[in-house]
C-alpha cells in the first residue's frame, strides 16, 4: 500500500463570463478556489479504482473535475466518458505534483454521468471515478419566513423552512414610508438569523437561496402614528405563528402597555415586553403579543392599549387556506395611440401572491404595492400601444387566480389587398372596428366612385391575432369585371384608408396597385 | 487543504443554549455530497456522535438528544452551526466537527477530517 | 441502537509487537465501519475505513478485517508514535456509535 500514490482530486467553480461551450484544460475564467472532494479508494474494488465524492452542478454551471498526483516520473492518462475516450494533457505544477484537469462548460444534462480518468504512472496504474450530476431543483423550495422567540432571551428568531438551507437576513428601517425602499440608504441589513434590536420602525425578515427571495413584515402598531382611515388586518392561515408588535414613545418611563383579545387580556406567555432610551432620551416601549401556533378562535381585534397614548387595533383573522380575493370579470379598454395608459389589478391575498403578466405569449415581471386598506394592487403599463389579449395570472400556492383584459388602440385602417383568379380581398385592423365599401373604376368614374352593390362579402373579426380583431371582405369575381380597376375602402371615426386592385383575366400573378387615399 | 474549525463559547451556564460554529475550508457543503458531523468526548470518555448535515440539507439526529439539537448550515459562510438547548454539567465535553464524504457508488467515506475540537464547561 | 464493544479496553505492549484490536457489534453492520487512532489533547485521525481500507498516507502496519458483527484493527510491529487510544465506529445505521476505546500503553 505505500507505493500508492498520494492522490488529491479536486472541484474548481467557474463564474462563468462566457457563452462558448466545450471541455478543455486551460479556459480563461473567473475561478473559485478549489474545493477537496475527499478522493479515497473504493473498498473492495477490483484493481486501485479511487473515487470522489459525487458532484452536484447547477444547470449552466462550469466546473473543473482537477487530478494531483504526487507520484516519480512521467504520467499519462485518458478520460473516458459515456464510452468515448477524451484528450487528456497533464502537466506538472510547482510542487512538482501531476495534474490533470477536465472542464465541463455550461452544464447540460447530457454532461451528467461518470468521468472516469485512467493515469499511468512508471510504478503503477490506477482509476479515478468522478461522478457529475445536475443538482435536482424540482426538490427545492422556498417558503416564507417566520418568527419565532429565541428561550430565554429578549430576540426575535427568523426561520425559513426551506431546500436549499436559504441564506436569511433582516432588513431594518428607522423612516416612514417610501424611504424604507430596499436599495435606500435608510435600510440596513444583517445577515443572521437571531435579531435583539427590536425597536426600529419597520422590521422584515427575508429568506434568499436558489428559487429566489420571500419576506415577512413584523406586523406593528405604532401608537405614536396617527391610526389608518380603516383598520389594519392581517391574515394568518391555522398553525402558523402570529406576532404583533405594539411600540409607543413617551417623554418618560411613566406609562405602560397591554394587549387585549375582544377586550380580554392575553394571557400570561402570550406577551412579552421591552423597553429602551432613544437617543433624545425618550423612552421606547416594545409589546409583542403572539401565538405560536394559531388556531381559529384566535381570530378577533387586538387591542394595544398605553396609559399615555390612545390605544389601536388591528383584525386578525384566521383562515383554514389561503385566498386570493378579486373580480376576475374582464375589462376591455380602448385608448388612443399615445395615450398613457396601465392596467391594474386590485386584490386582496393571504399569502402573498406571486405574479406574471403575458401578452403575445410572453411574460412581464410582475410588480405589487400594498395600499392602505389592506389590499393590494399590480399595475403593468409597459403594453407599447399594442392592441390585444393581456392576462394576469396569481397564485399563492392555496389559490390561482387570472384576469382577462383587452386592449384596443382607437386609430385609423390599414388595408391590405390581395387578388386570385375568382375574387379579390381586403382586410384592415384598424379600431373601431372598420366598414367596407368597393368601388369601379371606369371611364365613366375615373375617380373610382362608381358603387359595386352584388358579390361583396364582409366578415368582421373573422381571425384573433393575440386578441386582436381583423376585418375582412371579399368580392367575388363576375366575368364582366375582369380586367377593370377596383377599390376597397376601409372606414372608421377616425378615417378611411383604400387599396386599388386590378382584376386581371385569369393568371397566376394578379396585379395589386398601392393606392391609399 | 481541508480543515475545520470549531468555535463559541468556552463557558455556559446551567439551562442556557449553546451554539456552535464549525467554520470549513477547502472543501465546501454546496457543490459535492458531503456533510459535516457534530461529535462530542467528555473528559476522559468515549466519543458520542451527535448531528450531520449534509449539502442537500438531510440532517440526522442522536436519538437520545434530538429534542435538544438543531443544525443548520450556512453556505455563503462555509458554516455549520449546531445548537443544543437546556445545557447541563453533564454536558462538559471537547465538541468536534469532522467531515463525511458521500461517493458516486453510493458508500460514505466518515470522518476523514476533524476539527481540533473546543471544549465546552456547563458550570453555574 | 447498535452497539459497539471494543476490547480490551487497555493494553500493555512493547515496540515491535504485534498487537490486535477488537470490536463487536450488536448486529451485523456489512463492512461500514472505520478505525481511528487519538492522542491526548487531540482530535482523532482515520486510519481504516470500510473496515479494510486504509486511508491514504497512513502506515501500512495497520491493516483492517472483517464484517457483519467481528472487527479487529491490528499493529504488525508496533512504533513509539503507535501508543494512543483507539476506537472503532459503525455508521451502518443511525445513531452512528462509537466503540469506548482501547488505549494502547508502553509496557
Known amino acids: 500500500n505505500q507505493d500508492l500514490p498520494v492522490i488529491k482530486c479536486v472541484l474548481i467553480n467557474h463564474k462563468n463570463n462566457d457563452s462558448s461551450v466545450g471541455k478543455s484544460s486551460s479556459y480563461p475564467m473567473v475561478s473559485e478556489s478549489p474545493e477537496d472532494l475527499g478522493c479515497a479508494l473504493r473498498p473492495q474494488s477490483a484493481g486501485t479504482v479511487y473515487e470522489a465524492a459525487t458532484v452536484e452542478v447547477d444547470v449552466s454551471a462550469s466546473i473543473t473535475l482537477q487530478v494531483l498526483v504526487d507520484t516519480p516520473g512521467n504520467i499519462s492518462c485518458l478520460w473516458v466518458f459515456k464510452h468515448s475516450s477524451l484528450n487528456c494533457q497533464p502537466h506538472f505544477d510547482v510542487q512538482n505534483r501531476g495534474v490533470v484537469s477536465m472542464v465541463i462548460l455550461k452544464m447540460t444534462e447530457t454532461q451528467a454521468g461518470e468521468y472516469l480518468l485512467f493515469i499511468q504512472s512508471e510504478a503503477t496504474n490506477y482509476t479515478i471515478l468522478f461522478t457529475v450530476s445536475i443538482r435536482n431543483t424540482l426538490l427545492f423550495t422556498l417558503r416564507r419566513p417566520y418568527f419565532r422567540k429565541m428561550e430565554n432571551q429578549d430576540a426575535l428568531v427568523c426561520i425559513s423552512e426551506s431546500v436549499p438551507e436559504p441564506i436569511v437576513e433582516w432588513v431594518l428601517c428607522d423612516s416612514q414610508g417610501e424611504s424604507c425602499k430596499e436599495e435606500s440608504p435608510a435600510v440596513v441589513k444583517k445577515e443572521e438569523k437571531v435579531l435583539h434590536e427590536l425597536f426600529g420602525t419597520d422590521i422584515r425578515c427575508c429568506a434568499r437561496n436558489e428559487l429566489g427571495r420571500e419576506c415577512t413584515r413584523l406586523f406593528t402598531i405604532d401608537l405614536n402614528q396617527t391610526p389608518q382611515t380603516t383598520l389594519p388586518q392581517l391574515f394568518l392561515k391555522v398553525g402558523e405563528p402570529l406576532w404583533i408588535r405594539c411600540k409607543a414613545v413617551h417623554v418618560n418611563h411613566g406609562f405602560g402597555l397591554t394587549w387585549e383579545l375582544e377586550n380580554k387580556a392575553l394571557e400570561e406567555g402570550s406577551y412579552f415586553e421591552m423597553s429602551t432610551y432613544s437617543t433624545n432620551r425618550t423612552m421606547i416601549r416594545i409589546l409583542f403579543a403572539f401565538v405560536s401556533s394559531v388556531a381559529r378562535n384566535d381570530t378577533g381585534y387586538y387591542t394595544c392599549s398605553s396609559s399615555k397614548h390612545p390605544s389601536q387595533s388591528a383584525l386578525v383573522t384566521i383562515v383554514e387556506k389561503g385566498f386570493i380575493n378579486a373580480t376576475n370579470s374582464s375589462e376591455d379598454y380602448e385608448i388612443d395611440q399615445y395615450e398613457e395608459f396601465c392596467f391594474s389589478v386590485r386584490f386582496k391575498a393571504y399569502p402573498q401572491i406571486r405574479c406574471t403578466w403575458t401578452f403575445s405569449r410572453k411574460s412581464f415581471p410582475c410588480e405589487q404595492k400594498g395600499l392602505d386598506d389592506g389590499y393590494s394592487v399590480s399595475k403593468f403599463c409597459n403594453h407599447k400601444h399594442q392592441p390585444g389579449e393581456y392576462i394576469f395570472h396569481a397564485e399563492n400556492g392555496d389559490a390561482q387566480f387570472t384576469k382577462m383584459f383587452t386592449l384596443n388602440i382607437r386609430r385609423k385602417p390599414q388595408v391590405l389587398a390581395e387578388a386570385s383568379a375568382s375574387q379579390a380581398s381586403c382586410s384592415s385592423d384598424g379600431y373601431p372596428l372598420p366598414s367596407w365599401t368597393w368601388k369601379k373604376c371606369s371611364d365613366k368614374s375615373p375617380n373610382c366612385t362608381e358603387d359595386i352593390p352584388e358579390g361583396v362579402w364582409n366578415r368582421k373579426a373573422n381571425r384573433k391575432v393575440f386578441g386582436q380583431w381583423v376585418s375582412s371582405s371579399t368580392l367575388n369575381m363576375s366575368e364582366a369585371m375582369k380586367g377593370f380597376l377596383v377599390k376597397c375602402c376601409a372606414y372608421n371615426s377616425l378615417g378611411t384608408s383604400c387599396e386599388t386592385i386590378l382584376l386581371n383575366s385569369p393568371g397566376p400573378f394578379p396585379f395589386i396597385q398601392d393606392s391609399i387615399s | 487543504q481541508v480543515t475545520l474549525k470549531e468555535s463559541g463559547p468556552a463557558l455556559v451556564k446551567p439551562t442556557e443554549t449553546l451554539t456552535l460554529t464549525c467554520t470549513l475550508s477547502?472543501?465546501?457543503?454546496?457543490?459535492?455530497?458531503?456533510?459535516v458531523s457534530w461529535i462530542r468526548q467528555p473528559p476522559g470518555k468515549c466519543l458520542e456522535w451527535l448531528a450531520h448535515i449534509f449539502s442537500n440539507d438531510e440532517k440526522s439526529y442522536s436519538t437520545s438528544l434530538k429534542s435538544r439539537l438543531t443544525i443548520s448550515k450556512d453556505t455563503s459562510k462555509s458554516q455549520v452551526v449546531l445548537t443544543m438547548t437546556n445545557m447541563d454539567p453533564e454536558d462538559t465535553a471537547t465538541y468536534y466537527c469532522?467531515?463525511?464524504?458521500?461517493?458516486?457508488?453510493?458508500?460514505?467515506?466518515?470522518?476523514?477530517?476533524w476539527g481540533q475540537g473546543i471544549l465546552v464547561t456547563v458550570s453555574s | 441502537d447498535i452497539q459497539m464493544t471494543q476490547s480490551p479496553s487497555s493494553l500493555s505492549a512493547s515496540v515491535g509487537d504485534r498487537v490486535t484490536i477488537t470490536c463487536r457489534a450488536s448486529q451485523g453492520i456489512r463492512n461500514d465501519l472505520a478505525w481511528y487512532q487519538q492522542k491526548p489533547g487531540k482530535a482523532p485521525k482515520r486510519l481504516i475505513y470500510a473496515a479494510s481500507s486504509l486511508q491514504s498516507g497512513v502506515p501500512s502496519r495497520f491493516s483492517g478485517s472483517g464484517s457483519g458483527t467481528e472487527f479487529t484493527l491490528t499493529i504488525s510491529s508496533l512504533q513509539p508514535e503507535d501508543f494512543a487510544t483507539y476506537y472503532c465506529?459503525?455508521?451502518?445505521?443511525?445513531?452512528?456509535?462509537f466503540g469506548c476505546g482501547t488505549k494502547v500503553e508502553i509496557k
Open positions: 469532522a467531515r463525511i464524504v458521500g461517493y458516486g457508488t453510493g458508500w460514505y467515506g466518515f470522518f476523514d477530517y
Open positions: 477547502g472543501f465546501s457543503l454546496n457543490n459535492a455530497r458531503m456533510a
Open positions: 465506529l459503525q455508521h451502518n445505521s443511525y445513531p452512528l456509535t
